[in-house]
C-alpha cells in the first residue's frame, strides 16, 4: 500500500498556503482527486508529488494515491481542508444524477471541519426539505439523501453557520431517474386493417414508460411519418400517442406500418399490415377435405374459415339431406374470431347416426354477397352378413349378402365340424370372391354386395362361412347344413335394403 506524507488523515491549511503531498510506493504511483485548479504533479524517483503554492477553497477534497501495478489495488488517501472564512463550501458538482432508491451524494465539501456542527441541507431559496427526506452528512463527502425518490428531483443548497449567520453553497441539481425496466411498452391499434378504397381509417401508435425520456414514431413502409404527438401521464407512466387519421384511403396508403419506441434500455417495435381493397369480399375455405368419411358412432367437427370485409351480416349451417329434414342444432355450431377479418366456424357432430350422413352447407353473407361451402359426409359401417341356401338354375347355391361402407370384400370358407366361426385348424377350403355383385350403391348409403357359392352337395358335418371385411371391420355368417333341404329359400326373400 502506498504511503502519503504528511502521514495524517486530514490536513487543514489557509488559503494561499503551499501544500505538498508526497506519495511513495513499491512501484510507480499516481495521484487522483477532484478536478480542481492550481495543482502541479511531478515525479521524483519512486514517489509522486502533488503540490500547489496557492491553495484555494476549491482544493478542498480527498486526494488518493494508488499503485496501478498492485494487483490488490491498494490505495492511501488524505483529505485537505482549505478553510476560507468567506467560502465554507467547495461544491464538486453542478448536478447529481442517480436512479430511484439509490443514495444521492450531494458533494458539498466543508472547507473547515470546525463548522460541521452547524450544517444543514435546504432546497434553493431557503425552502425546507420535502417530508420524509432522510439524509446524513460527512465533512469529507457532503450530504447523502438516502434512498432518493423521483419526487426529490430538486435544486439543493448546503448551509453552514458562520458567526451566527447561515452561509449557502452554490446550488446542486439532483435528478432522480426512474428505474427503467426495459424499452417502452408499445401498442399499435388495430393489429390489422382492411378498408375499401375511399373509406376512412385510423391507426394509433402509443408508447409508455416510467421515465419521460423516450422517443416514439410511426413509419409506413420504412418512411417515418410526421404526426403530432399527444403526451399524457397517468398510472405513474408517461404516455406518448401518435394517431394517423386517413379520411379517404387509397392504394398508396396500404402496406406495413411500424410503431417504434426507444429509450436508454433499447428499442421496441411492433407492426401491422393495412390492406386497401377495391370492393367488399367474402372468402370461405376449409383446411379439411370437403368430402369426409367417418365411422358411424364417432364424432366430427366441420370447420370453415371465413375471410371477410366488411363484417358478416349473417351465417348458418344447413343440412341438405338426403335422410331427413332435421337441421343442425344451434348449440353444436361454434364461431371463433381469429382476428378482425378472419373467423372460424365449427359444426360439431358427436356420435354420428346413420340419418346424419349427407351434405352440410355453411352459408355466410356480407355486403359482398352470399357464399356457401358444402361438405359431403359419408358414414362408414362394418359389414353385416347373412347367408341362405337356394337353387339357381337347378344348382344348389349358398348366397351371401354383405352390407357396409366402404364396399366389403367377400371370402368363403369351408371347414370341418359345426362351428360359429371357422378357425385355421378346421379350414378345408377358402374361396375369395374378387368381384361380388353390387346390389345397391347410393350416395351416403351402405353398399350391398352379393356373392354366390355353388355347392353340388352339402356336406353334413361341415360348416360354410361367408366372411366380409372393409376398413372399418368385418362380419361373418356361418351356414350349417342340418339336412339336404335345409334353409332352402328363394333368394329375394333374404335380400334387404337398409
Amino acid at each position: 500500500i502506498p504511503v502519503i506524507e504528511p502521514s495524517v488523515p486530514e490536513l487543514v491549511v489557509k488559503p494561499g498556503a503551499t501544500v505538498t503531498l508526497r506519495c511513495v510506493g513499491n512501484g510507480s504511483v499516481e495521484w487522483d482527486g477532484p478536478p480542481s485548479p492550481h495543482w502541479t504533479l511531478y515525479s521524483d524517483g519512486s514517489s509522486s508529488i502533488l503540490s500547489t503554492n496557492n491553495a484555494t477553497f476549491q482544493n478542498t477534497g480527498t486526494y488518493r494515491c494508488t499503485e496501478p501495478g498492485d494487483p490488490l489495488g491498494g490505495s492511501a488517501a488524505i483529505h485537505l481542508y482549505v478553510k476560507d472564512p468567506a467560502r465554507p463550501w467547495n461544491v464538486l458538482a453542478q448536478e447529481v444524477v442517480v436512479f430511484e432508491d439509490q443514495d444521492a451524494l450531494l458533494p458539498c465539501l466543508l472547507t473547515d471541519p470546525v463548522l460541521e456542527a452547524g450544517v444543514s441541507l435546504v432546497r434553493v431559496r431557503g425552502r425546507p426539505l420535502m417530508r420524509h427526506t432522510n439524509y446524513s452528512f460527512s465533512p469529507w463527502h457532503g450530504f447523502t439523501i438516502h434512498r432518493a425518490k423521483f419526487i426529490q428531483s430538486q435544486d439543493y443548497q448546503c448551509s453552514a453557520l458562520m458567526g451566527g449567520r447561515k452561509v449557502m453553497s452554490i446550488s446542486i441539481r439532483l435528478k432522480v431517474q426512474k428505474v427503467i425496466p426495459g424499452p417502452p411498452a408499445l401498442t399499435l391499434v388495430p393489429a390489422e386493417l382492411v378498408r375499401i378504397r375511399g373509406e376512412a381509417a385510423q391507426i394509433v401508435c402509443s408508447a409508455s414508460s416510467v421515465d419521460v425520456n423516450f422517443d416514439v414514431f410511426l413509419q409506413h413502409n420504412n418512411t417515418k411519418l410526421a404526426i403530432p404527438q399527444q403526451s399524457d401521464f397517468h398510472n405513474n407512466r408517461y404516455q406518448k400517442v401518435l394517431t394517423l387519421n386517413l379520411d379517404q384511403v387509397d392504394f398508396q396508403h396500404a402496406g406495413n406500418y411500424s410503431c417504434v419506441a426507444s429509450n436508454v434500455q433499447g428499442k421496441h417495435s411492433t407492426s401491422m399490415f393495412f390492406r386497401v381493397v377495391e370492393s367488399a369480399y367474402l372468402n370461405l375455405s376449409s383446411e379439411q377435405n370437403l368430402i369426409q368419411e367417418v365411422t358411424v358412432g364417432e364424432g366430427l367437427n366441420l370447420k370453415v374459415m371465413v375471410e371477410a370485409y366488411p363484417g358478416l351480416q349473417g351465417f348458418n349451417w344447413t343440412y341438405l339431406g338426403p335422410f331427413s329434414d332435421h337441421q343442425p342444432e344451434p348449440k353444436l355450431a361454434n364461431a371463433t374470431t381469429k382476428d378482425t377479418y378472419r373467423h372460424t366456424f365449427t359444426l360439431s357432430l358427436p356420435r354420428l347416426k346413420p340419418s346424419e350422413a349427407g351434405r352440410y352447407s355453411f352459408l355466410a353473407r356480407n355486403p359482398g354477397g352470399w357464399r356457401a361451402l358444402t361438405f359431403e359426409l359419408t358414414l362408414r359401417y362394418p359389414p353385416e352378413v347373412s347367408v341362405i341356401w337356394t337353387f339357381i338354375n337347378g344348382s344348389g347355391t349358398l348366397l351371401c349378402a354383405a352390407s357396409g361402407y366402404p364396399q366389403p370384400n367377400v371370402t368363403w370358407l369351408q371347414c370341418s365340424g359345426h362351428t360359429d366361426r371357422c378357425d385355421e385348424a378346421q379350414v378345408l377350403q377358402v374361396w375369395d370372391d374378387p368381384y361380388p355383385e353390387v346390389l345397391s350403391q347410393e350416395p351416403f348409403h351402405k353398399v350391398t354386395v352379393q356373392s354366390l357359392l355353388t355347392v353340388e352337395t352339402l356336406e353334413h358335418n361341415q360348416t360354410y362361412e361367408c366372411r366380409a371385411h372393409n376398413s372399418v371391420g368385418s362380419g361373418s355368417w356361418a351356414f350349417i347344413p342340418i339336412s339336404a333341404g335345409a334353409h332352402t329359400h328363394p333368394p329375394d326373400e333374404f335380400l334387404f335394403t337398409p
Partner: antibody, heavy 117, light 110 residues
Framework: QVQLQESGPGLVKPSETLSLTCTVS????????WIWIRQPPGKGLEWIGY???????NYNPSLKSRVTISVGTSKNQFSLKLSSVTAADTAVYYC???????????WGQGTLVTVSS | QSVLTQPPSASGTPGQRVTISCSGS????????VNWYQQLPGTAPKLLIY???QRPSGVPDRFSGSKSGTSASLAISGLQSEDEADYYC???????????FGGGTKLTVL
Amino acid sequence: QVQLQESGPGLVKPSETLSLTCTVSGGSISSYYWIWIRQPPGKGLEWIGYFYYSGSTNYNPSLKSRVTISVGTSKNQFSLKLSSVTAADTAVYYCARSRLGSIFDYWGQGTLVTVSS
Amino acid sequence: QSVLTQPPSASGTPGQRVTISCSGSSSNIGSNTVNWYQQLPGTAPKLLIYSNNQRPSGVPDRFSGSKSGTSASLAISGLQSEDEADYYCAAWDDSLNGPVFGGGTKLTVL
C-alpha cells in the same frame, strides 16, 4: 490496463437526442473522474462534461442546458445524452479518464456521430 | 474559437528541433499547469506531457514541455517521421471551472 470504448448510433436526426455509452474495462469507474470530450471534423477538442461514479457531474457552460451525463445501465458504464442536436454537434465523441482536472491519461478510440436528416 | 491559442501548423525535417507554442490567460495557463496531447492521424489523443514538463512512462525524452507566465511550449528534438501528428495544449480554467484546449497544431515532418 484501463480501456474505454464508446458506443451508440452514428447518425442522429436534427432536434433529436444523441445518446452514447462509454464502457470501461480493466479498471473500475468507482474511482477517478471520467470525462466526455468531442472533436468536430477538422477542428480542435472541446470539453463536454465530467462524471464521478456517485452521480456527480459538471458540464461545459456552453452545453449545460442540453447535456446529461449519468451512470450507465450496467456496471462500469457511463452515458452521455445531448438533446436538441443540430449539424454543429457533428463530431467524434471521446470518453476519457481524468486526473486532477485536465490530465486525461486513458481515452476511448472515439465514435463519429453525424447529425443529419 | 479555442480558449488557448496555438499556431495551426508547424514543420521540420527529420533530426531537427521544433517548438509549438500555446498562449492563454491568467485564469488558465497563468494559474494552472499545462498538459500536452498528441493525436496521430485517425486515432484518439494521447497524453504526452502533464504538469508543464512531466512525461508519462513510455513517452520518449525527445519531448519536453515548459511554461512561463501565461504561455507554454512543447519542444520536440530529433524530429522523426512518426512525430507527424496534431498537438493540443490543455489547462484548467478557473473562470470556466473546467479544462480548456488549444485549437491544435498540425506538425508536418518534411
